[in-house]
Each structure stands twice: as structure tokens, then as C-alpha cells.
């Protein structure tokens, strides 16, 4: 699986979407888990309703919610009041028996809140000659860049790492 990056701003909500083949995964509950280390287990954070027909109902565990559009084939996870410690590698999973098939690997990145003036000196703003009209970004603010780092994904607010 490729890894899809979702960027969110500290203190705000981040929505992660995991598309899947609705017929292939028919009848299966879904889960969101956090990867513990590169080779470690994926620790369950939250799963959809015990009754698959009620998967559309939002279920919370702390500040993380999950809901499943089983007809459209989209699992949506909401991370509320995003914090730096939420950054890391996660998985969307499709369950059957005690098995969990990976639907998508997700890297959550937490950006500093631009309104938090403690970090104001670290903020980066595009110069006049730099245009991002064609970029589709989840948030209109950005973070300080490392040398050679692309400021925004060129085509989408989530991009793939191989």
C-alpha cells in the first residue's frame, strides 16, 4: 500500500477519507488504528458500529470519530482538536472475523496554528512571484519548509509516499 498524507492544523479538526470497493467489502465493519513503529502492531483507536447496517452512525473514542458510507464506499475518520501528538502513521481497516485488511495507510501531519503568535516567526508566506492557483490544499496556511521541500502537494491535498 502507498501512504496517503493528510495535513491538519493544530487545534482544528482533520477529516481523513478512505475510499474502498463497497461490494468487495460488503458486510464488513471498519476500523481506524495507529501503527506502533514500522513493524509493530496497529493499535485499534475506533471501529464502526457493531451492527454493520448501522455503520453510518458516528462512533467516538475520545477525540476521534469514525463513520462509514457503506453504499458509497467511503470510510471517514475525524480527528477533533488535532494535537502534535496525533501526528503519525495510521491505517483504515476492513474487518472480517478477527482479520483486518488494510484499506489505506495514512500519515497524519500536524501543522502549527498560524494564529498562535508563539510560532509567528516560523511561518512561511509565498513571495509575489510564487503562484499556487492550481494547487488543491486542505488548508490555506502552511508551515516552515525544509530546504528543497515542496510547499504544497502539486495536485491534491493528500499525496502518496511510496
Amino acid at each position: 500500500h502507498n501512504t496517503t498524507v493528510f495535513q491538519g492544523v493544530a487545534g482544528q479538526s482533520l477529516q481523513v477519507s478512505c475510499p474502498y470497493d463497497s461490494m468487495k467489502h460488503w458486510g464488513r465493519r471498519k476500523a481506524w488504528c495507529r501503527q506502533l513503529g514500522e513493524k509493530g502492531p496497529c493499535q485499534r483507536v475506533v471501529s464502526t458500529h457493531n451492527l454493520w447496517l448501522l455503520s453510518f452512525l458516528r462512533r467516538w473514542n475520545g477525540s476521534t470519530a469514525i463513520t462509514d458510507d457503506t453504499l458509497g464506499g467511503t470510510l471517514t475518520i475525524t480527528l477533533r482538536n488535532l494535537q502534535p501528538h496525533d501526528a503519525g502513521l495510521y491505517q483504515c481497516q476492513s474487518l472480517h472475523g478477527s482479520e483486518a485488511d488494510t484499506l489505506r495507510k495514512v500519515l497524519v501531519e500536524v501543522l502549527a496554528d498560524p494564529l498562535d503568535h508563539r510560532d509567528a516567526g516560523d511561518l512561511w508566506f509565498p513571495g509575489e512571484s510564487e503562484s499556487f492557483e492550481d494547487a488543491h490544499v486542505e488548508h490555506s496556511i502552511s508551515r516552515s519548509l525544509l530546504e528543497g521541500e515542496i510547499p504544497f502537494p502539486p495536485t491534491s491535498h493528500h499525496h502518496h509516499h511510496h
Epitope: D21, M23, K24, W26, G27, R28, R29, W52, L95, H96, G97, S98, E99
Partner: antibody, heavy 121, light 107 residues
């Protein structure tokens, strides 16, 4: 009604390959996982693997990796299993079965009649 | 792999008897257990899924029970047409595995 029609008996030589088929009718073939199970004479049942005809995704029992290859042809509503490098241990009846998910796990609800494969010189 | 053990390979009973066939898993399978019937002509049918749920069209004399690692299939009032081999199967963890089967005969 759902029917799974498997191909006829096969007599094959050791070292050869065989491809058996399972033609489905009475449901949308592309949308259901298909199971394959082995039964040696007078023995129990062994799970070989399953395939999702919609995209060809397959899961195998580690014991049958390299031995069995599962494929599906959506245009003819037919699932196939190819067995290679046959030995006497591969002499068995092979069943296909349509999987349903009930209460969160997969169950083989409809079974084919089985295909007898005999490996003999 | 999870081992499924049916300790009784052959069982003989009289018509009208209540018959119980047992199945043990090598680890907890969370009730993800199915029972199948294979008739002498080789045809296979699903009887019970999720330990105790009767598949549609299966006579009510069949019932299932159990939890954790120990499960059983009961035929309440044995009929001639029940002569068959009965297999349990766990659907909890891949690879899915079957018991060795219990052949049921009429005395």
C-alpha cells in the same frame, strides 16, 4: 437460484498442470468472493484460497501458494483454479463455494458439486 | 494456523435419537464457527453459522452451541436423511480451517 457448476473429472500425469472451472449463475458473480476447498479421499476439508472476481484479488492458504492459482473471468461468470507440478498428494476432489458475510465473517453458503482430480502415471 | 479437532470420527445412533457432535479449536475463535453437512453423494450444505444461527431451509432439529474453543452441533431427533459427515470450520483467522469430520450412521 444460485448454482455453481464445476468442470468434469480430470486424469493427469505427475508433473503436469490442470485447470478446473466453476461456472456461477443466479447471482452477480463479480460482487461475491469465491472460495476453493480441497478434499482428499476419506479425508477432511482444506481451505485453498478465495478470490474476488470484481478485481481478481486473491488470498491463499500459505500451504497452497505456488501450487494453486485462482483467477476469474467476469464475462463468462467463471472462476478457475490452476494446479501445477502435480503429485499424488494433489489427487482430491476440489470444491468451489460462494462466500457470504454473516455476522461479520465469511461463510461458504453455496457449494459446487466438486471436481475429482486424479494424478497417475 | 488454528487447529480444529473433532474427536469422534464416526458416530452410530438410532432414528429419533438426540445426537451431539463436538468440535474444539486450538484457540478462541470468537464464535466464528460454521457447521457443514456432506452427504454420501458428496454434496455439501451449510447448516449453522456463527455458532448457533440456523441457515435458511435447515430443519429446526439442528442446533449449535458453544463459545471460546469448545463448540457442538446437536441433532434433536435423528432422521434417515441425516446420514452424512459433519464438518466444523472456523472463520475467525486466515487460513480458515476445518475439523476432520464426524461420520454419522444409523444403527
Amino acid at each position: 437460484q444460485v448454482q455453481l457448476q464445476e468442470s468434469g473429472p480430470e486424469l493427469v500425469k505427475p508433473g503436469a498442470s490442470v485447470k478446473i472451472s466453476c461456472k456461477a449463475s443466479g447471482y452477480i458473480f463479480s460482487y461475491s468472493w469465491m472460495n476453493w476447498v480441497k478434499q482428499r479421499p476419506g479425508k477432511g476439508l482444506e481451505w485453498i484460497g478465495r478470490i474476488y472476481p470484481g478485481d481478481g484479488d486473491a488470498d491463499y492458504n500459505g500451504k497452497f501458494k505456488g501450487k494453486a492459482t485462482l483467477t476469474a473471468d467476469k464475462s463468462s461468470n467463471t472462476a478457475y483454479m490452476q494446479l501445477t507440478s502435480l503429485t499424488s498428494e494433489d489427487s482430491a476432489v476440489y470444491f468451489c463455494a460462494r462466500l457470504h458475510i454473516y455476522d461479520g465473517y465469511y461463510v461458504s453458503v453455496y457449494w459446487g458439486q466438486g471436481t475429482l482430480v486424479t494424478v497417475s502415471a | 494456523d488454528i487447529q480444529m479437532t473433532q474427536t469422534t470420527s464416526c458416530l452410530s445412533a438410532s432414528l429419533g435419537d438426540r445426537v451431539t457432535i463436538s468440535c474444539r479449536a486450538s484457540q478462541d475463535i470468537n464464535n466464528y464457527l460454521s457447521w457443514y453437512q456432506q452427504k454420501p453423494d458428496g454434496t455439501v450444505k451449510l447448516l449453522i453459522y456463527y455458532t448457533s444461527k440456523l441457515h435458511s431451509g435447515v430443519p429446526s432439529r439442528f442446533s449449535g452451541s458453544g463459545s471460546g474453543t469448545d463448540y457442538s452441533l446437536t441433532i434433536g431427533n435423528l432422521e434417515q436423511e441425516d446420514v452424512a459427515t459433519y464438518f466444523c470450520q472456523q472463520g475467525d483467522t486466515l487460513p480458515w480451517t476445518f475439523g476432520g469430520g464426524t461420520r454419522l450412521e444409523i444403527k
